[in-house]
Structures are given as C-alpha cells and as structure tokens.
Interface confidence: medium
C-alpha cells in the first residue's frame, strides 16, 4: 500500500462540483480542498501528467495548456485554474506507484463521531462527488502560464529567453517561452519563440494530447466519451456530438477522427479504449469484525466478468490525508467510535471511470478499566466491592470471584457501582476481577481491575469419624478426623472428658489423637472432641464409653 500525502492543495471555494480524477496529458485540474503536505501549495490548482511508459517526454502545446477539464457530479465541466506557483521546493520523484497529489476533502473529515450518523454510507458509482486523484506521481503542469509569484513592484523590467522541453521527470513547468516581467509585476508572455510562423498546426499535432472522460449510463450499460477540448471539434462519420462520442460498448476499442477549422490535415485519430462497466465493481467493507474498532479494510470487488485487460485497471484510495494505490486498503491503529472518510476511484488506462465514497465509523472499542475504590470483607460470609465505571462506552460489567481454584462470575448492570457478595466461605482469600464489556460487532471486554480480601473467621465445622477405644482397663484412645471447614487461622483439637456432670479431663493437641489414662474403673464417661481455629470453637463430637471392672 502506498499512502501519499497530497502535494498541491486546491481550493474548492470557487467550484460548484468536486472532480475525482485527472487523466493523461495534457492533464486535468485537480480540484479539492487542501490535504497534506510536501507537494501541496495553497490556493492553486495544479495539473499533472500521467506516468505511462509512452509519455516520458511530451511537447506541451499552447492549446493543450488551456484545456484542463474535470470530472463532475452532473457531467463534465471545464474548470479554469488559477496560476501555478513556482516550485521553489524541488520535488524529485522516481518512478513508482505513489500517486502524487491528492488534495482531499477527506482531510477535513470529522475526527470525532457524528451523532446519529450511519456507521457506513456508500456513495457508489460513476458520478459521485468525491476527491481528486491526479494520475501522475511526477511533475505538475500548469494550465495557465503566470509568473505572479515572481512579481514585485520593486523589480526592474527583465526579459529572459528560456527554451525547455516538458518531461514528466522534471519538477517544473517546461515550455518554450519568452517572458517579460514589467515593473508592475505583471508577466507578459510573448509567443515569438513558440510560433515563428502564422501557419495552422496539423490537427494531429493540435490534439496530440487530447484527454477523455468516460461517463456511464446504467440503463443502457453504454459509455459516453467526453473529449476535453474547448472548441467544438468535428469527428469523422459524424461520430461525435458536442464533443461527446456516444454509445460506446465496454471493453471495446473505438476509433475517432478529430478535425477542426483551426488546424489542417492530417486529422487526429483517437483510439478510445472503453473501460469495463461501472456496475461490475463494488466497493466492499472487508474489515474483520474482531478488529473493527481500530481498523478499516476496503476492497474493490469484481462482481461480474468483463473482457477488458485487468492489467490496465488501477485503483486509488484516499483516506484522510493519505493516498493508497491498491485494490484493497487496510488502515490500522485508528480511534474507536470515530468516523473516517475514504474516497476511491478506479481508472482504466489512466482514465477514471468510476468512484465511490465511504464514511466508516469504527466500532466501539474495548471499554477502559473500572477503578476499584475498595474491596473488603466485614463478615465471615460476605464481602463488598465498590468502583467507578470506565470512561468509554460499555454495556455491562462482569464480576468474577475466585477462591483457590473455583471461579464464579456474575453479570452486573452497567449502572451499578457497588456489589455485595453473599454466601462466601469464612476465612478464605477471594480474588475479585471486574471488567466492563460492550456488545458491538463482537463482544469486547475491557481490562479487568483486580482486588482481593479474606473473609472473617467463623466457627469451624464438627470433627468427624471420632472413635473411642479401650487400651487397658483404665485407659482410652480417642481419635477423630479434622473438620471439613476450619474457618479460621489456627488448628487445635480439644478433648473434654466428663464423668456425670463433672469435667475430669481437658486436653488440647495439635492432632486429634488423645490417650486418656488413669480413669476410674467401671465408670461411664462422656468424651467431647472439638476443633478450635484460634477464633472460634467448633461443635463437639460426643461419644459415651465406660471403663470395665478391673480385671486384677
């Protein structure tokens, strides 16, 4: 892809319509509001030549310099251009695919979203108002020879003779001229060196560099070729009317013989290489939905076959201030929820035959990260989290809370800024993650804000699988399994032994393994085992057991 800042800014203030393209020599006026940057000179229209292999060196005739035309929304109109600035800044382009100047209204495209606008508006076709693409990546040629930029009342009269040939690799207007600069600053061009005899030129010479615009009729599916000349020319076999050749079939060559009373034989034989039908091309939005928040992809699709040589078809895009010379473009790193205007055109043998404009609004971007204000637990089974919402658009929140390897997620309303978590496990670390999301072309999740808390302690659950076994006449062995839920920071097992209602033993161990000795013989005992977590005791497990009558 070749994005190209436009070289010469052209104002549209005086022009009722905005043409989209220019054709080969002698070139078309590029009318458009200024875009950037190195090639642009403000307040001047500039013409450009096509960079085709057979146009490497061309003589510029005085007539051809007066005949710049522009493609129009309602047809073709002639656009008079102001004077050309002298290019004091050198431009030295080399042959390449970059389109040189492109002054575009898209440069003034809104960089902020427009409320109520459609995400995509498509202005297809053969006559839409769009931008101007000069076909030439090389030298600008003027339509009027004026040296006003050099004018100065303080300068003395000066006469200079210069003879230069116009070459598309040059950066300056080249013509054979004699220039007189008067003290008042006006430039007078004497034609003494341009035409040394009053004889008429041949029509072949006069119209050597005639340019053509093609207009398409969707109903008849035929083209009209508009000959870009000022005078009403005559065509052999009366094939043209008002400088227009009608009923041309796509992808067919037509030969037109051009003559006029201001020139002599031989006539100019113009071969019209008719482009493919406009409806065979469609500008398609090829943006991947996953990336539609920050990228735009546009692609010309051939939706029907045609016999024209596809090698002769070139595609141009202008998005904002940059130009691309591809059939497909992809703009990256764009702003979400912004409108971007792209103008495009298709040229056949450097003649524009269709164009389209798209205003694409990038999709909603991922929401920002919510800002957690606090997140804490003030009870054994509850926690609370509060937050500020993210700045960018979003639809809802997802709150996830993770304990060890378990994860639970909740969908929360976008208006919430606080959530109370219930039924939590006591004395457990919970990691919370909160993110906003938006359902756009796809769901886009914002970055998650994280926090954590540990719930308060609670009584542990009961020990289990408690056993009491006699190891001797007056000794017992008490064992139990740990509680399922400790619910606190510490681990201690307690055993209370009662005879009747009297507590006779009270022991505490790290493990639930007690050896109780020296009990009374033939006595009923109550054994109570429970777990203490440092904050709370658990419910005791109670077993009754009796010592036997002493065997001795």
């Amino acid at each position: 892809q070749s994005p190209t800042p436009s070289p010469t800014g052209l104002t549209t203030a005086k022009m009722p319509s905005v043409p989209l393209s220019s054709d080969p020599l002698p070139t078309h006026t590029t009318a458009f509001s200024p875009a950037s940057t190195f090639e642009r000179e403000n307040d001047f229209s500039e013409t450009t030549t096509s960079l085709s292999p057979d146009n490497t060196s061309t003589q510029v005739s005085p007539d051809s310099l007066d005949n710049a035309s522009a493609f129009n929304t309602t047809g073709v109109s002639s656009v008079q251009t102001p004077h050309l600035p002298t290019h004091a800044d050198s431009q030295t382009p080399s042959a390449g695919t970059d389109t040189q100047t492109f002054s575009g209204s898209a440069a003034n495209a809104k960089l902020n979203p427009t409320p109520g606008s459609n995400a995509i508006s498509d202005v297809p076709g053969e006559r839409s108002t769009a931008s101007t693409f000069p076909t030439d990546p090389v030298s600008p040629l003027t339509t009027t020879l004026s040296l006003a930029h050099h004018s100065s009342a303080a300068l003395p009269a000066r006469t200079s003779n210069t003879t230069i040939t116009a070459n598309t690799s040059d950066a300056y207007l080249n013509a054979s001229e004699t220039t007189t600069l008067s003290p008042s600053g006006s430039a007078v061009i004497s034609t003494t060196t341009i035409a040394t005899t009053p004889s008429k030129p041949t029509c072949d010479e006069k119209y050597a560099n005639i340019t053509v615009d093609y207009l398409y009729n969707k109903e008849t599916k035929l083209f009209t070729a508009k000959l870009n000349v000022n005078e009403n020319v005559e065509c052999g076999n009366n094939t043209c009317t008002n400088n227009e050749v009608h009923n041309l079939t796509e992808c067919k060559n037509a030969s037109v013989s051009i003559s006029h009373n201001s020139c002599t034989a031989p006539d100019k034989t113009l071969i019209l290489d008719v482009p493919p039908g406009v409806e065979k091309f469609q500008l398609h939005d090829c943006t991947q939905v996953e990336k539609a928040d920050t990228t735009i992809c546009l692609k010309w699709k051939n939706i029907e076959t045609f016999t024209c040589d596809t090698q002769n078809i070139t595609y141009r895009f202008q998005c904002g201030n940059m130009i691309f010379d591809n059939k497909e473009i992809k703009l990256e790193n764009l702003e979400p929820e912004h409108e971007y205007k792209c103008d495009s055109e298709i040229l056949y043998n450097n003649h524009k035959f269709t164009n389209a404009s798209k205003i694409i609004k990038t999709d909603f971007g991922s929401p920002g990260e919510p800002q957690i204000i606090f997140c804490r637990s003030e009870a054994a089974h509850q926690g609370v989290i509060t937050w500020n919402p993210p700045q960018r658009s979003f639809h809802n929140f997802t709150l996830c809370y993770i304990k060890e390897t378990e994860k639970d997620c909740l969908n929360l309303d976008k208006n919430l800024i606080k959530y109370d978590l219930q039924n939590l496990k006591p004395y457990t670390k919970y990691v919370l993650s909160l993110h906003a999301y938006i359902i756009a072309k796809v769901q886009r999740n914002g970055s998650a804000a994280m926090c954590h808390f540990t719930t308060k302690s609670a009584p542990p659950s009961q020990v289990w699988n408690m056993t009491v076994s006699m190891t001797s006449d007056n000794s017992m062995h008490v064992k139990c399994r740990p509680p399922r839920d400790r619910n606190g920071p510490h681990e201690r097992y307690h055993l209370e032994v009662e005879a009747g209602n009297t507590l006779v033993r009270n022991e505490s161990h790290k493990n639930c393994d007690f050896r109780v000795k020296d009990l009374q013989y033939s006595t009923d005992y109550t054994f109570k085992a429970y777990f203490h977590n440092g904050d709370y005791p658990g419910e005791p497990f109670i077993l009754h057991h009796s010592t036997s009558y002493n065997s001795k």
């Epitope: 892809q1 070749s2 994005p3 190209t4 800042p5 070289p7 800014g9 509001s33 200024p34 875009a35 950037s36 940057t37 190195f38 090639e39 642009r40 000179e41 403000n42 307040d43 800044d89 431009q91 030295t92 382009p93 080399s94 042959a95 390449g96 695919t97 970059d98 040189q100 440069a107 003034n108 960089l111 990546p137 998005c319 904002g320 201030n321 940059m322 010379d325 703009l331 990256e332 790193n333 971007y340």
Partner: antibody, heavy 119, light 106 residues
C-alpha cells in the same frame, strides 16, 4: 510500540559524505511516508527530506537539494539519508520521523543522531 | 515558503496556570498545524495534530484551536512536567516550524 532508531551520525570534514540510517519497528513501515528533520543545537527545527511509502515520490527543500538523497528499504524497515558535499551549516541532530496516517504530520520521532561538519 | 511566527518565545508560568501559545502563518494553512513538545535532550513529541486533535496518550489539559492563519495551543492547568519547549508545525505546504516557545515555571 512505535520505535525509530537513527544511526550513522559522525564528525566529518566539509565536502565529505555521510549516510544516516533509521530502523523502524512497531508499525507497518511500508504503509507510511517518512521524513528527516534536523535541529541545530538549542535552535529550531528544519525539514530535510520526505519519501512516500513506496519510495516513488521524494521531496527536498532548496537547502539540501542536489546534495542529500532520501531512500528507503521496505524489506529491511529502514530509512536512509545520504548526505554529500556536507557544509558546516548541516551540523545538527537529525531525526527520523513517521508521518501520521491520516493528517500527514509527524506522529513519531526517533531520538536523533548527531552530525558535526567541521574541519 | 509559508512562514510560521510563534509567540511568545519565552514564557514563565506557575503550576495550575492556564497557558496559551500562538502560531501565525504567513498564509492560510487550512488547519494543517501540529503542536510538539520537546524536553531538554529529548526528541519532539506530538501533542496535537490537525489543529485540535489530541494525540494518543496526551493528557486532556492540552488543547488546540484555530483556523486560517491563526492557531493556539492551550494548557488548561500547567503541571511541573509541562516544562519544555513547544513548537508548531505547518504541513499545508511542505513543512515549516515555528521558532519555539520555551516554557518555564515561575
């Protein structure tokens, strides 16, 4: 993250040549116009040269025209500035700059490389 | 060539102050104006592009305005880290920079 790293700056005698390089990363180099800007120590900024994404269009101001050549190698993501017939007034820090995709201004700059022309 | 006249060339302000820097073009530049911040020993950094569009990652206290030939950079509430030299750049026709405004804290 967009990164532009210039190199090749040196102390040279007037009339000699020097070639600056700028390696780009973090963006699709082939999609963007590039520019060289220079700054005389403690002074203002001056545009030096610009090149289109494919290298097909090149622009210079009068001050360096016919002496400096900007070029790029898209396969290597590298921008070059060949400086010939150097003069003392070319002494400056030279910055490699990426043009904004939409408006055409300079949206990312390298840290610069210092060129001193002195006998 | 389009000339850019930037004023003032030197500015001293206090933290929290509203600061404005102006650039005047010798002819209409159709909003093709960017503002850059350059801190000592560093490369310039884009703040505002195309007159009033805040570049990614730049604090919202920076704003730009203007049209035709007159353009303004505004810092709504000056912060210590804003001490730098500020340049305007027109890229309507080739590139020309303003002379710079050195901003210091009082």
């Amino acid at each position: 993250e967009v990164q532009l790293v210039e190199s090749g700056g040196d102390l040279v005698q007037p009339g000699r040549s020097l070639k600056l390089s700028c390696i780009a990363s973090g963006f699709t180099f082939t999609n963007f116009w590039m520019t060289w800007i220079r700054q005389v120590s403690g002074k203002g900024l001056e545009w030096v040269a610009s090149i289109s994404s494919s290298g097909g269009s090149i622009y210079y101001p009068d001050s360096v025209k016919d002496r400096f050549t900007i070029s790029r190698d898209n396969a290597k993501n590298t921008l070059y500035l060949q400086m010939n017939s150097l003069r003392s007034e070319d002494t400056a820090t030279y910055y490699c700059v990426k043009l904004h995709y939409y408006s055409g201004g300079g949206d990312a700059w390298g840290q610069g490389t210092s060129v001193t022309v002195s006998s | 060539d389009i000339q850019m006249t930037q004023s003032p060339s030197f500015l001293s302000a206090s933290v929290g102050d509203r600061v404005t820097i102006n650039c005047k073009a010798s002819q209409n530049i159709n909003k093709y104006l960017d503002w850059y911040q350059q801190k000592h020993g560093e490369a310039p950094k884009l703040l505002i592009h195309y007159t009033n569009n805040l570049h990614t990652g730049i604090p919202s206290r920076f704003s730009g305005s203007g049209s035709g030939t007159d353009y303004t950079l505004t810092i709504s509430s000056l912060q210590p880290e804003d001490v730098a030299t500020y340049f305007c750049l027109q890229h309507s026709s080739r590139w020309t920079f303003g002379g710079g405004t050195k901003l210091e804290l009082k």
